[in-house]
Each structure stands twice: as structure tokens, then as C-alpha cells.
């Protein structure tokens, strides 16, 4: 055992940039720190076989399997995967350890399996076995958390039935509005399932696992706050638990709170009250209304009344199935090159949506903001003034929604020219779409002012590059024109751009670009 080399097997996970097939070499990528794979001598095996802990990676992940060998002298090696030999290039690190790497870029099913590394050193031969499998993330779920009352205690339990089991945290804030943003100093996070301090202004519970993070806010009516102009609305699906908190502060304890549904007092066991004195000796009371599993008949106006405050209501709507309400008609926008502009979608949805903005096959993160009227809005400003088609896509498990936007950037044309043996062609992407003129340059017309009336074929919007229209114009060449210079000009309301082409032989031409504003 003392003669055997000290072997360290590690996994390096890369943040994906590019796609390729496995490479047995080092490869420049943004990488996480190496993770030890607990390589150990495999018991009762013929020959010296080291085995690494099984590696499970997501589809499309990029990884490096790496072996570090503490052995004197040179080493030679060979990778074998599915009976194919792969090139192996060992090198030595600063600690003079032999380093052998296998890069797997954009993991696919075909790249999963056993990777065998055969190493030959001056002292001994040995094999290292890596097993790489694809994680079955299809079984993963992340469900929005919900609340339950803790048995025999005035406390709420936050539950999220997710796989893998999520980390549950309460997110508490005692300020109003903007200062309750996630990373604000006013926000306190408690990584536990049970919450006893239920008097705060803003209470949310969040669950997170490998799939992301989902949060649920404790719906609250604050009788000391001015009511919203529109009645607050709470949507729930049949079978979900209902929790509404009514909160009121008064100079002394001489007040009470009650809940009513459609002017009828809630049944015993459907509410519970808590009270406390605040630092300035005023009394805070909260009254929870709850239904462990809502039915259609739980729909209606829930009103919280106080003997010392004006009452306030909320409309609870129970739906069979989730929904996304928004207008899906496509929208076209025309803006100047430096004009500030954001796409915007206003929608009402339950459960909360997950959304993406897509342009040119690239997806961008989607932020959504709740409005006072119960609607939400998602804006996208990161278009960098690139014309084309932008897609907003939203889904929430029950419903899907897609809306298309076209962005046109007003600018003068820019002409590209090319010629073949039989024709000359110009194209331009300016907006509004340009019109074309062709001029002939000759002894009679050195300034190229002689119109070419025939043989011109204009195609407007002949190809749509991610929603970006391109206009082109083609001149069919006659024998008489060969050897002449011609000029194609594209013009729109913002200006004109021209290019000069020599009609002699095929191929891309050097050209002279004139710009006439």
C-alpha cells in the first residue's frame, strides 16, 4: 500500500459558455472550485483500481473529471469510454503532481457512462474509474409554500411540498412599500419552518431548492392604513388553504376585531386572535381568518371590523384552475435610435407566473411587479436598441401566455452590395423600409445621375431576421452594361445611402459608399 501513489480525483463544474464534445485536455472556461470525489482503491478487484464517487450532472452541464497523482517520474495515460480510446495529455502542477483531465462539454445521454483512465508510471500501473450519470431532474418539483396553524400554539408553519426537500425561510419586514425589497436592511430572514412573531407589517415565506425559489405572502388587511382605491383581491384554487390576517393598532386595549364573510360572522374555529403591546404601549391586535381547504362557496367579501377603526374588505375568489389574463395581441413599436423605451405587459394571474423575455433565441430574466389594482406588470428595457421580434412568455402550471412585440428602430438605410455574373444586388435594413433607385455612371453622367429604368427588381422585406425586415433590390445585367459602374441608393425619411458597383466579373466587389443625408 505504501508504494501505491496518492490519488486525488476531483470534479470541476463549468458555467456553460459553448458547446462541444468531450476533450481530453484543459479548456478555458469559467469554473467552480474542484470537488473531491473520494477516490479509493476498489476492494477485491483484479489489479489496482481506484474508484471515484458517482458523479450526477444535469443535462447540458459542462464538467471536467480530473485526477491528481503524487508519483515520482513521468506518467503516461489513456482514457477509455465506451470501448473507444481517447487521447490523454498529462501535465504537472506547481506541486509537481501529475494532472490528467477529461472535459465533457454540454453533457448529453450519450456522454453518460463509465470513464476509465489507465495510468502507467515508472513504479506501477493502475486504473481510475469515473461513473458519470445524468440527474433525473424531471422528478424535481418546487411548490409554492402555504401556511398551517401550529397545533395548540399561536404560530404559523410554512410548508412546501417539494423535491428535493426545500430550505424554508420566513422573510419579515416592518417597513412599508419599497423598503421591503428583498435585499433591504429592513428585511429580516429566519431559516425555520415555524413563525411565532406574527405582528410584523409584511410576512412572507419562501422555499428554495435546486429549481429555484418560490414565495407566498401572508395576505394582510391593515385597518390603520388608508384603504386602496381598488378592493384588494385574493385568488385561490379549490383545495388550497386560505389565510387572511387583519391587523389593527390602538392607543389602548379597548377594541376588538371580527371577521365576516358576506355579512355573516365566521364560524368558531375559522379564526384566531393574538395581541401584544408595542414599544410605545399601544395595543396591536391581529385576527386571522383561515380555511384549511377552500371550496367554491368560500368565495366572497371578507370584512374585518373593529370597534375603533373603519372596517375594510377583501374579495376572495376561488377558482377551479389557475389563469393568466392579459391581452395577447401583438404590438409594434417604432422608436428613435437613442430613445428610452421599455416593453410592458400588464396581466392578472393566479398562481404567480414564471416568465421570460426572448429575443434572437436568447432568453432574458423576467421581473414582475404587483400593482395596487391587483394586476402585475413585467417590463423589458434591455433591448439595446436592436430591432426585431421580442417575445414575452408566461406560465404558472395551469395556464400559458405568449405575447409578441416588434421593435423598429428609425434610422437611415445602410447599403450592402454584391454582384454575380448576371446581376447586381443591394440590400438594406434601415427603417422605415427604404425605396430604391439605380443610376448608371458613364462619360455622359460622371456623377451617376442617369437613371436605370429597366431590369430592376425590388423585394421588400424578403427575409425576416428575428423580426428584422430587410429590403433588397436586384439589377439584372445586360451585355451592354458590363464594365460600367452603377450606383444603388436606398432612401427613407431619415436619409439616403448609396453604393457603387463595377459590373464586370462575379464575386463580392470593393465598393465606394456615398452617403447623402
Amino acid at each position: 500500500n505504501q508504494d501505491l501513489p496518492v490519488i486525488k480525483c476531483v470534479l470541476i463544474n463549468h458555467k456553460n459558455n459553448d458547446s462541444s464534445v468531450g476533450k481530453s485536455s484543459s479548456y478555458p472556461m469559467v469554473s467552480e472550485s474542484p470537488e473531491d470525489l473520494g477516490c479509493a482503491l476498489r476492494p477485491q478487484s483484479a489489479g489496482t483500481v481506484y474508484e471515484a464517487a458517482t458523479v450526477e450532472v444535469d443535462v447540458s452541464a459542462s464538467i471536467t473529471l480530473q485526477v491528481l497523482v503524487d508519483t515520482p517520474g513521468n506518467i503516461s495515460c489513456l482514457w477509455v469510454f465506451k470501448h473507444s480510446s481517447l487521447n490523454c495529455q498529462p501535465h504537472f502542477d506547481v506541486q509537481n503532481r501529475g494532472v490528467v483531465s477529461m472535459v465533457i462539454l454540454k453533457m448529453t445521454e450519450t456522454q453518460a457512462g463509465e470513464y476509465l483512465l489507465f495510468i502507467q508510471s515508472e513504479a506501477t500501473n493502475y486504473t481510475i474509474l469515473f461513473t458519470v450519470s445524468i440527474r433525473n431532474t424531471l422528478l424535481f418539483t418546487l411548490r409554492r409554500p402555504y401556511f398551517r396553524k401550529m397545533e395548540n400554539q399561536d404560530a404559523l408553519v410554512c410548508i412546501s411540498e417539494s423535491v428535493p426537500e426545500p430550505i424554508v425561510e420566513w422573510v419579515l419586514c416592518d417597513s412599508q412599500g419599497e423598503s421591503c425589497k428583498e435585499e433591504s436592511p429592513a428585511v429580516v430572514k429566519k431559516e425555520e419552518k415555524v413563525l411565532h412573531e406574527l405582528f410584523g407589517t409584511d410576512i412572507r415565506c419562501c422555499a428554495r431548492n435546486e429549481l429555484g425559489r418560490e414565495c407566498t405572502r401572508l395576505f394582510t388587511i391593515d385597518l390603520n392604513q388608508t384603504p386602496q382605491t381598488t378592493l384588494p383581491q385574493l385568488f385561490l384554487k379549490v383545495g388550497e388553504p386560505l389565510w387572511i390576517r387583519c391587523k389593527a393598532v390602538h392607543v389602548n386595549h379597548g377594541f376588538g376585531l371580527t371577521w365576516e364573510l358576506e355579512n355573516k360572522a365566521l364560524e368558531e374555529g375559522s379564526y384566531f386572535e393574538m395581541s401584544t403591546y408595542s414599544t410605545n404601549r399601544t395595543m396591536i391586535r391581529i385576527l386571522f381568518a383561515f380555511v384549511s381547504s377552500v371550496a367554491r362557496n368560500d368565495t366572497g367579501y371578507y370584512t374585518c371590523s373593529s370597534s375603533k377603526h373603519p372596517s375594510q374588505s377583501a374579495l376572495v375568489t376561488i377558482v377551479e384552475k389557475g389563469f393568466i389574463n392579459a391581452t395577447n395581441s401583438s404590438e409594434d413599436y417604432e422608436i428613435d435610435q437613442y430613445e428610452e423605451f421599455c416593453f410592458s405587459v400588464r396581466f392578472k394571474a393566479y398562481p404567480q407566473i414564471r416568465c421570460t423575455w426572448t429575443f434572437s433565441r436568447k432568453s432574458f430574466p423576467c421581473e414582475q411587479k404587483g400593482l395596487d389594482d391587483g394586476y402585475s406588470v413585467s417590463k423589458f428595457c434591455n433591448h439595446k436598441h436592436q430591432p426585431g421580434e421580442y417575445i414575452f412568455h408566461a406560465e404558472n402550471g395551469d395556464a400559458q401566455f405568449t405575447k409578441m412585440f416588434t421593435l423598429n428602430i428609425r434610422r437611415k438605410p445602410q447599403v450592402l452590395a454584391e454582384a454575380s455574373a448576371s446581376q447586381a444586388s443591394c440590400s438594406s435594413d434601415g427603417y422605415p423600409l427604404p425605396s430604391w433607385t439605380w443610376k448608371k455612371c458613364s462619360d455622359k453622367s460622371p456623377n451617376c445621375t442617369e437613371d436605370i429604368p429597366e431590369g430592376v427588381w425590388n423585394r421588400k422585406a424578403n427575409r425576416k431576421v428575428f423580426g428584422q425586415w430587410v429590403s433588397s433590390s436586384t439589377l439584372n445585367m445586360s451585355e451592354a452594361m458590363k464594365g460600367f459602374l452603377v450606383k444603388c441608393c436606398a432612401y427613407n425619411s431619415l436619409g439616403t445611402s448609396c453604393e457603387t458597383i463595377l459590373l464586370n466579373s462575379p464575386g463580392p466587389f470593393p465598393f465606394i459608399q456615398d452617403s447623402i443625408s
Partner: antibody, heavy 124, light 107 residues
């Protein structure tokens, strides 16, 4: 360099809940099939295995302490957390966390790397 | 649960002695057994895994044998640094169980 480090209160009152955190580095429970266990050792006594969590989030508990134990992990923070409710003076011990790799050919080398341990005293 | 009976519970020996510690499982655990050495105030250190595989970096005077229900740890020639407590661990099935330990002392 693979390390595991236990942290938590050194003194707990009877009936309280003990929460211990094992923070590890040099490996993860995200990509490699690994597990982390908690083991304890009362002063002058033998080692006692408490709970284990696998990278796929499966859990296993000591039969005698099952009703009082909860093990969980936060992969992104490289932490495994153990809670032991209703603490009693007999729970006074050094608590260790240790790593166990899993190999595809079905064998396991048991715990290959251990934390240094943290001493917890239960007293009123 | 699988019970692990370790014997002897304590043992006095001299430097250079050959020492054997035994672990008996209450049911067949194949070769899913590991041996650990623990010194006072320290964490256990793995010596042997899979009943007979020597941990990398552990001196070859340590060896393990056995399969099924009977297992032994042998130290062929005791060295001063070997005086410690030794534990066996079965990891064939959950819950995992340790032996009661063997305290190896200088005679």
C-alpha cells in the same frame, strides 16, 4: 483540501432544541453522490451514529432517536443541519459530522473524512 | 438493527506485539465494515474499509480480514503511536452501528 466543521451552541438547557451545522468544503452534495452523517460520543463512551443525508435528499435516522431528530441540507451553502429536540443531560456529547462517498459498483468506504467535533453540554 | 459486538473492550500490550481485535455482527453484513482509530480529543480516523482494504497513507502493519459476521483488525507490530481506541462500523444497512470500542493501552 476536504474539511468538515461542526458548529452550534456549547451549552443547551434541558427540553430545548439543539441545532448543529456541519459546514464542509472541498466537495459538494450537488454533483457527486455523497452523504453526510452525524455521529456523537458521550464523554468516555463509544461512538453513536445519529442520522445520514444522501445527495438525493434521502434521509436515515437512528431508531432510538428518530422521533427527536431532523437532518437537512443546504447544497448551495455546503451545509448539513441536525436538530435534536427535547434535550436531556444524557445528550451531553461531542457531536461529529462525517462524509461518506457512494460508488457505482455498490460498495462504500464508510466515513472517509470527519469533522473535528463540537462538544455540547446539556445542563440547567 | 444490526448489533456490533467488539472484543475485547480493553487490551494491554507492548511495543512490538501483534494485536488482534474482533468484531461480530448480529447478521450477515458481507464486507461492509470499516475500522477506525481514535485518540483522545480527536476525531476518528479510518484505517480499513470494505473489511480488508487499507486506507491510503495508513501503515501496512494494520490489516483487516473477515466477511459475513466475523471480522478482525490486526496490528502486526505495535508502535507507540498505535495506543488508542479502535472502533468497527457496519455500513451494510441503516441504521449504521458502531462496535463498543477497544481501548488499547501500554502494558
Amino acid at each position: 483540501q476536504v474539511t468538515l466543521k461542526e458548529s452550534g451552541p456549547t451549552l443547551v438547557k434541558p427540553t430545548e432544541t439543539l441545532t448543529l451545522t456541519c459546514t464542509f468544503s472541498g466537495f459538494s452534495l450537488r454533483y457527486a453522490r455523497m452523504g453526510v452523517s452525524w455521529i456523537r460520543q458521550p464523554p468516555g463512551k463509544a461512538l453513536e451514529w445519529l442520522a445520514h443525508i444522501f445527495s438525493n435528499d434521502e434521509k436515515s435516522y437512528s431508531t432510538s432517536l428518530k422521533s427527536r431528530l431532523t437532518i437537512s441540507k443546504d447544497t448551495s451553502k455546503s451545509q448539513v443541519v441536525l436538530t435534536l429536540t427535547n434535550m436531556d443531560p444524557v445528550d451531553t456529547a461531542t457531536y461529529f459530522c462525517a462524509r461518506m462517498p457512494e460508488y457505482s459498483s455498490g460498495w462504500s468506504g464508510a466515513f472517509d473524512i470527519w469533522g473535528q467535533g463540537t462538544m455540547v453540554t446539556v445542563s440547567s | 438493527d444490526i448489533q456490533m459486538t467488539q472484543s475485547p473492550s480493553s487490551l494491554s500490550a507492548s511495543v512490538g506485539d501483534r494485536v488482534t481485535i474482533t468484531c461480530r455482527a448480529s447478521q450477515d453484513i458481507r464486507n461492509d465494515l470499516a475500522w477506525y482509530q481514535q485518540k483522545p480529543g480527536k476525531a476518528p480516523k479510518r484505517l480499513i474499509y470494505a473489511a480488508s482494504s487499507l486506507q491510503s497513507g495508513v501503515p501496512s502493519r494494520f490489516s483487516g480480514s473477515g466477511s459475513g459476521t466475523e471480522f478482525t483488525l490486526t496490528i502486526s507490530s505495535l508502535q507507540p503511536e498505535d495506543f488508542a481506541t479502535y472502533y468497527c462500523l457496519q455500513h451494510n444497512s441503516y441504521p449504521l452501528t458502531f462496535g463498543g470500542g477497544t481501548k488499547l493501552e501500554i502494558k
